[in-house]
């Protein structure tokens, strides 16, 4: 089942996605679609990156963070219903059926007031419950333990106040990711 | 050719008000996070503030936070930055500077303006 | 908050190795990016992505990153490598750009 977010229109959607490259500068290819992931690469692309860079974007959608260190969270800028559905980020791992794969669903719900045309905080409501740990092994996914006791009324809450970035990457402290090689 | 041009800066005495302009050729400006960078004189560079493509989303260094506004015309190809209240430490060297491709925040700076110097004495 | 630190002067002879250092809590853990700046001009990004060079930017240039140092290496340093550089990173926590302070290039003779 997919992990799902909450964002409302006129927002910005912040949907997470971490590996850990196997060393400094190898990085695995990613895309990012709309739609679940099928048996091979991404259906309907918004973005993609290579061994190096981002070599395909399309407007409102952009990486959120360092993605040559791992982080290839995606932000979608100015939300419409229209965006919601689910969202494949997929880690095209070397070898044959290697790929990571994680449907995430985003669910847009109707803004309660009208949102400011320019913001300098910008947040998705709602943090996964699953995350994919860390391993050696094939990636696992379980509730981290790890995680901070915190509820998902309570995230929504601390997440007018806290950047999506900073929770982002207090989640990954926790382990959140997977490791590559 | 990317090209960035700086225009506005000038004297202005401390409190005053000033707008920077930087027109932007040579890319889609829509496509890439921007940035103000400014250096005072003989000194380092600071971060001022950076702003989206789509220009729905700003930042703003500490020191400027509340007085400086950093906005974007993507019609017209042109990044603003509002410069209110200022001080005289608010002198230096402004560039506006293009992030790179396809990250929300411009990660680093691929390109540079060749500055417009704001002066702020009475 | 993050700070980096840069020494704020290294000197080198014509045709050595120059390595200029940026230290960071974990800086591993981030992308480091260099800019050259000679007087009165703009900066110039020389190294992106710790290791990256830019187009046009001689292969004498390179980067690494590790634990809590990033160093730029400039081999067979020319009189031309003469400038002000700065090493940046971007930090999520606060989604601040950060600079180091600077380190001046000296070539000597």
């Known amino acids: 089942s997919e992990v799902e977010y909450r964002a409302e229109v006129g927002q910005n959607a912040y949907l997470p996605c971490f590996y850990t490259p196997a060393a400094p500068g190898n990085l695995v290819p990613v895309c990012w679609g709309k739609g679940a992931c099928p048996v091979f690469e991404c259906g309907n692309v918004v973005l993609r990156t290579d061994e190096r860079d981002v070599n395909y974007w399309t407007s409102r959608y952009w990486l959120n963070g360092d993605f040559r260190k791992g982080d290839v969270s995606l932000t979608i800028e100015n939300v419409t219903l229209a965006d919601s559905g689910i969202y494949c980020c997929r880690i095209q791992i070397p070898g044959i059926m290697n790929d990571e794969k994680f449907n995430l669903k985003l669910v847009i719900k109707p803004a309660k007031v009208t949102p400011a045309p320019t913001r300098q905080r910008d947040f998705t409501a709602a943090f996964p419950r699953m995350l994919t740990t860390r391993g050696h092994g094939p990636a696992e996914t379980q509730t981290l333990g790890s995680l901070p006791d915190i509820n998902l009324t309570q995230i929504s809450t601390l997440a007018n106040e806290l950047r999506d970035s900073r929770l982002a990457n207090d989640l990954r402290d926790s382990g959140a990711t997977i490791r590559i090689g | 050719e990317v090209q960035l041009l700086e225009s506005g800066g000038g004297l202005v005495q401390p409190g005053g008000s000033l707008r920077l302009s930087c027109a932007a050729s040579g890319f889609t400006f829509s496509s890439y996070a921007m940035s103000w960078v400014r250096q005072a004189p003989g000194k380092c560079l600071e971060w001022v503030s950076a702003?989206?493509?789509?220009?729905?989303?700003?930042y703003y260094a500490d020191s400027v936070k509340g007085r400086f506004t950093i906005s974007r015309d993507n019609s017209k190809n042109t990044l603003y930055l509002q410069m209110n209240s200022l001080r005289a430490e608010d002198t230096a060297v402004y560039y506006c500077?293009?992030?790179?491709?396809?990250?929300?925040?411009?990660?680093?700076?691929?390109?540079w303006g060749q500055g417009t110097l704001v002066t702020v004495s009475s | 908050s993050y700070v980096l630190t840069q020494p704020p002067s290294v000197s080198v002879a014509p045709g050595k190795t120059a390595r200029i250092t940026c230290g960071g809590d974990n800086i591993g853990g981030k992308s480091v990016h260099w800019y050259q700046q000679k007087p009165g001009q703009a900066p110039v990004l020389v190294i992106y992505?710790?290791?990256d060079r830019p187009s046009g930017i001689p292969e004498r240039f390179s980067g690494s990153n590790s634990g809590n140092t990033a160093t730029l290496t400039i081999s067979r340093v020319e009189a031309g490598d003469e400038a002000d550089y700065y090493c940046q990173v971007l930090d999520r926590r606060s989604d601040h750009f950060l600079f180091g302070c600077g380190t001046k290039l000296t070539v000597l003779g």
């Open positions: 500077a293009r992030g790179s491709y396809g990250t929300y925040y411009g990660n680093y700076f691929e390109y």
């Open positions: 992505y710790d290791s």
């Open positions: 702003i989206s493509g789509s220009g729905g989303s700003t």
